[in-house]
Interface confidence: low
């Protein structure tokens, strides 16, 4: 949606021109505008930026093409024929009319817009081979940009790790994206919200279908980027969902309390070889470095396809798999380390944490082993494995007591 920016315009350093796929003068008339307003406009990624003049570095408005529906040629009111200089951009929630100086300019704008939203060069427009070549170059740039583009709240964590992060750092947000655990070329969204006095964790599947991401909800919703996926969740919950941004100060190692086998005391356990943590999120898409140290880690042995199955609640509740199903956010038997605590050794007697809580029990045992992420882990594998074993043991003991 076109939105005037509130902050004062801070010009970029002189000489640093915005890098646009295409730019020209463009007159724009939004749904609330009475007349066309002339801008210098530039297309970059899935956004058209509008400037007061072609000498400006700071845009005054921007228009996101994430909700693109179609482009149509426009015959101005009162005209009997198409002068070739008007076109309409139809987005899911609004229509914006544009006026340009020439037919060639109109076809160029339509061509570049279609190139970025449909990831193809539209050869059916009135364009010259040179224009098509320019669009093919933009297409290559846009495909490369999309391949690297990930929102700040995308973390390479498993389902369990995502849940733990949202529980541990509620002040950092309550929505995160993570790789799809079923090995499919998609992502999953994990959210945590208060519902009837209980924190509820929900998981949603987002399927990758070509260049689109389709959110698997009752009315499947397609988006052109992961950022648009995040926007969908934020806007459809009236901003109750906040993208998760992990501050640099937060610990990247999951520690937990374990009973010392010799003296029965509770001790702090932090695995000695910390796994790579998520990079501190600074807001805005950040490229994933293709050959980061994260990628060089030996891959974890793949588990049988269990990542995306819920831990089966005990009792009559069926095993659930996704889509708008709720899981009460359990207080896992994990004490999370306070902020800024120096990294303790593997065994540290009585760290400054509260007493070990009793696990909130789902009236029974775990239906299946808790999974370990197939992506690079946020938390050390050893720690998770121990925690999983610990959970399993505790719940089995409880089950035995109950029967």
């Amino acid at each position: 949606m076109a939105s005037a920016l509130r902050p004062p315009r801070v010009p970029k350093p002189k000489g640093v021109l915005p890098s646009h796929y295409y730019e020209s003068f463009l007159e724009k008339k939004g749904p609330c505008d009475r007349d066309y307003k002339k801008f210098w406009a530039g297309l970059q990624g899935l956004t058209i930026y509008f400037y007061n003049s072609n000498r400006d570095f700071q845009h005054v408005e921007k228009l996101n093409l994430g909700a693109f529906e179609k482009l149509t040629d426009e015959i101005p009111w009162g005209s009997s024929r198409d002068p070739g200089t008007h076109f309409s951009l139809i987005l899911r929630d609004q229509e914006i009319k544009f006026k340009v100086e020439t037919l060639e300019c109109r076809e160029m704008w339509k061509g570049f817009i279609l190139t970025v939203v449909e990831l193809r060069v539209p050869t059916d427009l009135t364009l010259l081979p040179g224009h098509l070549y320019m669009m093919s170059e933009v297409l290559a740039k846009e495909e490369a940009r999309r391949a690297l583009e990930t929102p700040s709240c995308f973390l390479k964590v498993s389902r369990l790790e995502a849940q733990l992060l949202l529980e541990r750092y509620p002040e950092c947000g309550n929505l995160l994206l993570r790789p799809s655990g079923d090995g499919a070329d998609g992502v999953s969204v994990t959210t945590r919200q208060m519902h009837n006095g209980t924190h509820v964790v929900r998981h949603y599947k987002v399927k990758r279908e070509g260049p689109k991401y389709v959110i698997d909800v009752e009315q499947p919703f397609s988006c052109t980027s992961l950022d648009a996926v995040v926007n969908y969740f934020v806007s459809h919950t009236k901003k109750a969902l906040v993208p998760f941004l992990l501050d640099e100060d937060y610990e990247k190692v999951l520690g937990y309390v374990e009973a010392d086998k010799e003296n029965g005391e509770n001790v702090w356990v932090a695995p000695s070889a910390p796994g790579p943590g998520p990079a501190p999120c600074t807001g805005g898409p950040k490229p994933l470095s293709p050959a980061s140290s994260q990628d060089k880690l030996p891959p974890l042995p793949p588990l049988p396809n269990q990542e995306e199955n819920y831990v089966t609640p005990i009792g009559d509740g069926p095993a659930v798999d996704y889509e708008n199903q709720d899981v009460a956010s359990s207080s896992w038997p994990v004490i999370l380390k306070p902020k800024k605590l120096p990294k303790p050794p593997a065994k540290l007697p009585k760290p400054p944490v509260g007493p070990k809580p009793e696990p909130k029990v789902f009236n029974g045992g775990l239906g299946r082993k808790l999974p370990v992420s197939s992506a690079q882990p946020l938390f050390p594998t050893a720690g998770l494995a121990d925690m999983t074993a610990e959970l399993q043991k505790k719940l089995e003991k409880r089950r035995a007591l109950e029967h």
């Epitope: 279609l114 449909e118 990831l119 193809r120 060069v121 539209p122 050869t123 059916d124 081979p129 098509l132 669009m135 093919s136 297409l139 290559a140 495909e143 490369a144 999309r146 391949a147 279908e209 070509g210 260049p211 689109k212 389709v214 397609s222």
Partner: antibody, heavy 117, light 109 residues
Framework: EVQLLESGGGLVQPGGSLRLSCAAS????????MYWVRQAPGKGLEWVSS????????YYADSVKGRFTISRDNSKNTLYLQMNSLRAEDTAVYYC??????????WGQGTLVTVSS | DIQMTQSPSSLSASVGDRVTITCRAS??????LNWYQQKPGKAPKLLIY???SLQSGVPSRFSGSGSGTDFTLTISSLQPEDFATYYC???????????FGQGTKLEIK
């Protein structure tokens, strides 16, 4: 004149592999997504796979997922379909097609793949 | 996945007849629907795209209508060369995912 010419079909045993090629001429090959569509003898059309203009995005029908791989070489104006672990039900005429703004506007004449022991 | 159901699966008609073939999508596909004609041993030929737009070079006796889930292909006055199999095809999620109807075989009565 627009032309799409498929090749690489033939007789293969179940479990075997074949690589189909589709040579394009007469249009801007890099400018559009490409497809493979197949038609089993006496049956209807079945979409098999798609690839985006630059080759970054690929998509497959469930029936071939994990066995077939679509790719393209824009410098050679050629589309490929690598078919592994072939089954009897993959027997069909395979067409390559190219999309316009709303349509598959160009089709090849097809190449026959027969999977039989 | 979106399913496309064509009816009837076969149809006998005479030259000069008006013929209607319908296609139903399992969910709304707006007007992202194409109609193809296929003759034995040949590649499919596009007749109608975007539900109602006539592909260039296609005779005006062919027309398409509908949007959402229900679509129709009409041949206003059958000609001998129109006896063939007709397929509808959805193109909903942009460029990459297509589903065809099972086809309608149009035969001479």
């Amino acid at each position: 004149e627009v032309q799409l010419l498929e090749s690489g079909g033939g007789l293969v045993q179940p479990g075997g592999s074949l690589r189909l090629s589709c040579a394009a001429s007469g249009f801007t090959f890099y400018g559009g997504s490409m497809y493979w569509v197949r038609q089993a003898p006496g049956k209807g059309l079945e979409w098999v796979s798609s690839i985006s203009s630059g080759g970054s995005y690929t998509y497959y029908a469930d029936s071939v997922k994990g066995r077939f791989t679509i790719s393209r070489d824009n410098s050679k104006n050629t589309l490929y379909l690598q078919m592994n672990s072939l089954r009897a039900e993959d027997t069909a005429v395979y067409y390559c097609a190219r999309v316009g703004y709303d349509t598959m506007d160009y089709w090849g004449q097809g190449t026959l793949v027969t999977v039989s022991s | 996945d979106i399913q496309m159901t064509q009816s009837p699966s076969s149809l006998s008609a005479s030259v000069g007849d008006r013929v209607t073939i319908t296609c139903r999508a399992s969910q709304s596909i707006s007007s992202y629907l194409n109609w193809y004609q296929q003759k034995p041993g040949k590649a499919p030929k596009l007749l109608i795209y975007a539900a109602s737009s006539l592909q260039s070079g296609v005779p005006s006796r062919f027309s398409g209508s509908g949007s959402g889930t229900d679509f129709t292909l009409t041949i206003s006055s059958l000609q001998p060369e129109d006896f063939a199999t007709y397929y509808c095809q959805q193109r909903w999620y942009w460029w990459y995912l297509f589903t065809f109807g099972q086809g309608t075989k149009l035969e001479i009565k």
